[in-house]
């Protein structure tokens, strides 16, 4: 099988591969399609040993415009030759293809989190899945940004071992009766554009400024 053919039409799909809650999610958008597909089928093979394209079971005849590939794409060294077919009823509307290399193409979505404000500190609870595959750790670090009155402070909590299970971080030495906003994101070791979570804000209750984070618990 040869994937090097010199005639390339402008692809009719835009793909994005993201690590969402430590799952590999491939999503797509269609460009200039007058007829919207009723369903899609996703197929792939590994470029280093091209075989027949394999249909992704949970993404065959799917109406969704995304596909969870965590259990299919296990290697950060391989390039995955991917074909997306769009159908309307029994008619094939289009087929687009792209090669993905997780080590360089992956973008990292922020984890889910909650915040609870106390008099002079905020508890940030970050939710990670209970088990994360080793190859999906991607040399990531968690960043928690605290914003108040135009000042942004970055916190880089040290997480022992894998990013798995729930993680709580305390932002302390805060000023009572002040509005604080928090954003979290995953930072890659490379200069990659980060995807920050939407801000979550809380107005801290009034209280004694000398009150310690411990006594507020």
């Amino acid at each position: 099988i040869s994937y090097d053919s010199p005639d390339y039409t402008d692809e009719s799909c835009t793909f994005k591969i993201s690590l969402r809650n430590f799952r590999s999610i491939l999503s797509w958008e269609l460009k200039n399609h007058s007829i919207v597909p009723t369903h899609y089928t996703l197929l792939y093979t590994i470029m280093s040993k091209p075989e027949d394209l394999k249909v992704v079971k949970n993404c065959a005849n799917t109406t969704r415009s995304f596909c969870d590939l965590t259990d299919e794409w296990r290697s950060t060294h391989e390039a995955y030759v991917t074909v997306l077919e769009g159908f309307s009823g029994n008619t094939t509307l289009f087929s687009c293809s792209h090669n993905f290399w997780l080590a360089i193409d992956m973008s990292f979505e922020p984890p889910e989190f909650e915040i609870v404000g106390f008099t002079n500190h905020i508890n940030v609870m970050v939710k990670f899945p209970s088990i994360v595959e080793e190859e999906l750790q991607f040399d990531l670090s968690l960043v928690i940004e605290e914003q108040s009155e135009g000042i942004v402070k970055k916190h880089k909590p040290e997480i022992k071992g894998n990013m798995s299970g729930n993680f709580t971080y305390i932002i302390d030495k805060l000023i009572p009766n002040t509005n604080y906003c928090v954003s979290v994101y995953l930072e890659h070791s490379d200069e990659q554009a980060v995807i920050k979570s939407p801000l979550k804000c809380t107005l801290l209750p009034p209280g004694q400024e000398s009150e310690s984070a411990e006594s507020a618990k």
Epitope: D4, S75, H77, H98, W101, A103, Q192
Partner: antibody, heavy 117, light 112 residues
Amino acid sequence: QVQLQQSGPELVRPGVSVKISCKGSSYKFTDYAMHWVKQSHAKSLEWIGVISTYYGNVKYNQKFKGKATMTVDKSSSTAYMELARLTSEDSAVYYCARSSGSYLDYWGQGTSVTVSS
Amino acid sequence: DIVMTQTPLTLSVTIGQPASISCKSSQSLLDSDGKTYLNWLLQRPGQSPKRLIYLVSKLDSGVPDRFTGSGSGTDFTLKISRVEAEDLGVYYCWQGTHFPYTFGGGTKLEIK
């Protein structure tokens, strides 16, 4: 036949920057990442980094962070590497090489950069 | 970073005779996916590098079967069963298991 055509030799003064290019042809450019490799007499071959030609994501060798900046122009199927604040240690031949995953399969012909006052 | 050490530095061989190049890595190149991303390149005089072997032993298309790659973990070998004139140049091993990718210092194959 897959081709990676690199820009011509550069003779530059110390302290300035230089931007070299690598144009891919006869294959779908955005399906392959592009690597840059330095070859000097002193250090043999050194991997500088890799760029996703589809997303523009980059991965650098720590040693070249701040020295090299990789970019890509999808519309012209061209990858670029800019080398900043050049010194005599940057005199070398620079190669681009495409890869599917960790497999570098085709290399450009190389661009010679000579830094001299 | 992983250090790749190649020996010998220079290899002088008569045409038709065998040749062997050793490559050792400072840590194992076996990845968690079960594959070993050890590769060999040949750079002929005045040319750019060309891929010979990937994944320890897989020959690139067009590479003659007199070339064989072997090894595992940290010790690897490139063998040429019968050297031909077109084989002269510098041979490099390199690893793609761990970032940053790293190269051996090269072995120059000369024809006696």
